[in-house]
Interface confidence: medium
């Protein structure tokens, strides 16, 4: 709305940088062939690029990424009883970000 | 995969708490009747609850919220020239989070 301007602080742009985000660990990251198990923990923190750039035709993108393997529990339920196994999930952390020009493919004439 | 266990650190649950997120300021928050304008800044930071809880039937939810009005620029394009106006957008920040039981409606028998 255009009302109550006095109390409002000027909005500050969310700059393009890494922020902590929550990544849900889906079961198919661990085993696509079997659904009879649970994963713990169900979510972890990752570093991801987010925010806006000063220009319309640029986008906030990761300029440097790092793969980070983490161990999770794969809890298989066999005859109503759990069997705990370790599984490795590889997470992607963004280490650095940049405002990158969006390349729109030109129509072929 | 179940391989390369040695190099992987145990995964740590992303606890239920407030984290900084990026909120895109959409034009219809400012004016639903007119599309012939731009908003600056296009995105801002907000505090939001995210993460996982220790239990299956609970969800990470905001237990305390605060409305925060911010001033943005509404840039109208009139005859190819920009006209700058001020507008207020009210953002929602989460101040505190809790793991709340998911109430699943029981089927009526």
């Amino acid at each position: 709305s255009l009302g109550s301007l006095a109390a409002a602080e000027p909005a500050v742009i969310a700059e393009c940088k890494t922020r902590t985000e929550v990544f849900q660990i889906s079961r198919n990251l661990i085993d696509r062939t079997n659904a009879n198990f649970l994963v713990w923990p169900p979510c972890v923190e990752v570093q991801r690029c987010s925010g806006c750039c000063n220009n319309r035709n640029v986008q906030c993108r990761a300029s440097q990424v790092q793969m980070r393997p983490v161990q999770v529990r794969k809890i298989e339920i066999v005859r109503k009883k759990p069997i705990f196994k370790k599984a490795t999930v590889t997470l992607e952390d963004h280490l650095a970000c940049k405002c990158e020009t969006i390349v729109t493919p030109r129509p072929v004439t | 995969s179940l391989g390369s266990l040695a190099a992987a650190e145990p995964a740590v649950i992303a606890e239920c708490k407030t984290r900084t997120e990026v909120f895109q300021i959409s034009r219809n928050l400012i004016d639903r009747t007119n599309a012939n304008f731009l908003v600056w800044p296009p995105c801002v930071e907000v505090q939001r609850c995210s993460g996982c809880c220790n239990n299956r039937n609970v969800q990470c939810r905001a237990s305390q919220v605060q409305m925060r009005p911010v001033q943005v620029r509404k840039i109208e394009i009139v005859r190819k020239k920009p006209i700058f106006k001020k507008a207020t957008v009210t953002l929602e920040d989460h101040l505190a989070c809790k793991c709340e039981t998911i109430v699943t409606p029981r089927p009526v028998t």
Epitope: W40, K80, F84, K86 | N54, R56
Partner: antibody, heavy 120, light 107 residues
């Protein structure tokens, strides 16, 4: 204060029965799996039994299977261990302990224990 | 049934590093936890999921687990660390404890 308090221990004759209770306070009991662990005098720790947060999963050490029954009453924030056909080798301090997750995991909170003595 | 084997005793001079081992078949495939127990007291969790330290546990406590052996390491051992230490792993449907290791801090 987050705590577990066991009760119900005592002297019982071989073949007899006892029911141990564990009262939980200071946390949402219904969100946690629980276990009983025992320790014979001068010996090491021995896991006895486990129950999931909602009571749907229960399992037991081979040494007590068929004789002991674990249960819980989430409305009363209480864990139980019904011990039947007691033997001399069941003499131990019995601890109730909390798992941090609904499925189990480490034992992050322990009670102070209650002594069970099986002797004629 | 699955067994975890620990040395009955380990001695260390104050300020030195103590290492307590726990071995079991393919133990590296399971998450190992370590508990400290002082005389007349209930056990206390000092390491969980191989290498994680609960809040309130000093940084000198650390853990590792690979192959057939998990290790609890206490760096700069202090007199107050003298206690029994138990490893534990949840394997097929049961929580298994090692036999325990008595850590003596030499005076």
């Amino acid at each position: 204060e987050v705590q577990l308090v066991e009760s119900g221990g005592g002297l019982v004759q071989p073949g007899g029965s006892l029911r141990l209770s564990c009262a939980a306070s200071g946390f949402t009991f219904s969100s946690y799996a629980m276990s009983w662990v025992r320790q014979a005098p001068g010996k090491g720790l021995e896991w006895v039994s486990y129950i999931s947060d909602d009571g749907s999963l229960k399992y037991y050490a081979d040494s007590v299977k068929g004789r002991f029954t674990i249960s819980r009453d989430n409305s009363k924030n209480t864990l139980y261990l019904q011990m039947n056909s007691l033997r001399a080798e069941d003499t131990a301090v019995y601890y109730c302990a909390r798992h941090p997750y609904w499925y189990g995991g480490q034992l992050d909170l322990w009670g102070q224990g209650t002594l069970v003595t099986v002797s004629s | 049934s699955y067994e975890l084997t620990q040395p009955p005793s380990v001695s260390v001079a104050p300020g030195q590093t103590a290492r307590i081992s726990c071995s079991g078949d393919s133990l590296g495939s399971y998450f190992v936890h370590w508990y400290q127990q002082k005389p007349g007291q209930a056990p206390v969790l000092v390491i969980y999921d191989d290498s994680n330290r609960p809040s309130g546990i000093p940084e000198r406590f650390s853990g590792s687990n690979s192959g057939n052996t998990a290790t609890l390491t206490i760096s700069g051992t202090q007199a107050e660390d003298e206690a029994d230490y138990y490893c534990s792993a949840f394997t097929h449907n049961s929580d298994v404890f090692g036999g325990g290791t008595k850590l003596t801090v030499l005076q």
